[in-house]
């Protein structure tokens, strides 16, 4: 999906209002410095591409993020403010339901959510301080 035509201001508002709080709750008890940055993004559409990938694509070491509250809210936000996004996600959702796994907050999931927080922070920072 091409995120270029999303309403970035509305997505930013939703993130600051709800998604960020759910991410921080998930990470409670973990310092942000516990994990190094292993993923970045270079503009707002790119950030959303990487956020979608980390949030909804199961990985061998962290398969359950898509069922978390922050993921559900992320999905709703993207569906609301990115034209045509919900249609592209129907097949992906059906495939995900087939491979449900039990919910375990592993260290690798914490690391992945830490990376997600970093991506969201870059998304809401429209410009660097300077240059």
């Amino acid at each position: 999906y091409d995120f270029t035509n999303c309403d970035f201001q509305k997505i930013e508002a939703d993130y600051l209002r709800t998604i960020s709080k759910d991410l921080i709750t998930y990470m409670s008890g973990t310092k942000s410095t516990d994990f190094n940055n292993t993923v970045s993004c270079s503009n707002r559409p790119h950030c959303l591409t990487e956020i979608q990938s980390l949030t909804f694509n199961p990985t061998p070491r962290c398969a359950s993020l898509a069922k978390e509250m922050f993921a559900r809210k992320t999905k709703a936000t993207l569906a609301l403010w990115c034209p045509g996004y919900s249609e592209t996600q129907i097949n992906a959702t059906q495939a995900m339901k087939k491979r449900r796994k039990r919910k375990v907050t592993t260290n690798k999931c914490l690391e992945q959510v830490s990376q997600l927080l970093g991506l969201w922070r870059r998304f809401i920072r429209t410009l660097l301080k300077k240059q």
């Epitope: 190094n36 940055n37 292993t38 993923v39 970045s40 993004c41 270079s42 503009n43 790119h46 990487e50 870059r122 920072r125 410009l127 660097l128 301080k129 300077k130 240059q131």
Partner: antibody, heavy 122, light 108 residues
Framework: QMQLVESGGGVVQPGRSLRLSCAAS????????MHWVRQAPGKGLEWVAV????????HYADSVKGRFTITRDNSKNTLNLQMNSLRAEDTAVYYC???????????????WGQGTMVTVSS | SYVLTQPPSVSVAPGQTARITCGGN??????VHWYQQKPGQAPVLVVY???DRPSWIPERFSGSNSGNTATLTISRGEAGDEADYYC???????????FGGGTKLTVL
């Protein structure tokens, strides 16, 4: 463990070519801008080239423009530097380095490789 | 093209504060990064975006930037701080990375 490992250095005659590679591991390579920086023996750091996270743009220092080409293969997590028409003044340790970027602005080099030595001599 | 000027050398007594400067035209309008390089090793980022510090760098390292001068400050200097230090900016007008000439820090 985030890591950059350079290879391909060696001794080469003036006018000849050499290809350096940099293997990335431990991070999502395709999301970072990547650079080559060199350091002549006993001298300071000199930036050589940059390639955008998606390979869509490249920029070069004037000293290597037209002779060096930076490329990347995001499917293999590798960065390359093709060096043609080498000169004695290209003798240096060559480092690859990662840098987050925002639009067309590059941020600090937060991870560096260990470097590979290139000696141009007849 | 944009030029960054550093003093070739700076000395500090153990336990004292060292300040390494980096001069450039209106450098305060740019984000400045600082690297430490010990002999035979690759550079290591010690301060980025003027004054931010990577999590693995001790609090003794700090930075500031305004006007035409950026400064790296190393408080309570130790023998292990002996190294070359380089400032760096991204010059967006020319799309080039620029390094200062480097400063050799000696802990007496």
């Amino acid at each position: 463990q985030m890591q950059l490992v350079e290879s391909g250095g060696g001794v080469v005659q003036p006018g000849r070519s050499l290809r350096l590679s940099c293997a990335a591991s431990g991070f999502t390579f395709r999301t970072y801008g990547m650079h080559w920086v060199r350091q002549a023996p006993g001298k300071g750091l000199e930036w050589v080239a940059v390639i955008w996270y998606d390979g869509s743009y490249t920029h070069y220092a004037d000293s290597v423009k037209g002779r060096f080409t930076i490329t990347r293969d995001n499917s293999k997590n590798t960065l390359n530097l093709q060096m043609n028409s080498l000169r004695a003044e290209d003798t240096a340790v060559y480092y690859c380095a990662r840098s987050p970027q925002w639009e067309d602005i590059f941020e600090a080099f937060d991870i560096w490789g260990q470097g590979t030595m290139v000696t141009v001599s007849s | 093209s944009y030029v960054l000027t550093q003093p070739p050398s700076v000395s500090v007594a153990p336990g004292q504060t060292a300040r390494i400067t980096c001069g450039g035209n209106n450098i305060g309008s740019k984000s400045v990064h600082w690297y430490q390089q010990k002999p035979g090793q690759a550079p290591v980022l010690v301060v980025y975006d003027d004054s931010d510090r990577p999590s693995w760098i001790p609090e003794r390292f700090s930075g500031s930037n305004s006007g035409n001068t950026a400064t790296l400050t190393i408080s309570r200097g130790e023998a292990g701080d002996e190294a070359d230090y380089y400032c760096q900016v991204w010059d967006s007008s020319s799309s080039l990375v620029v390094f200062g000439g480097g400063t050799k820090l000696t802990v007496l």
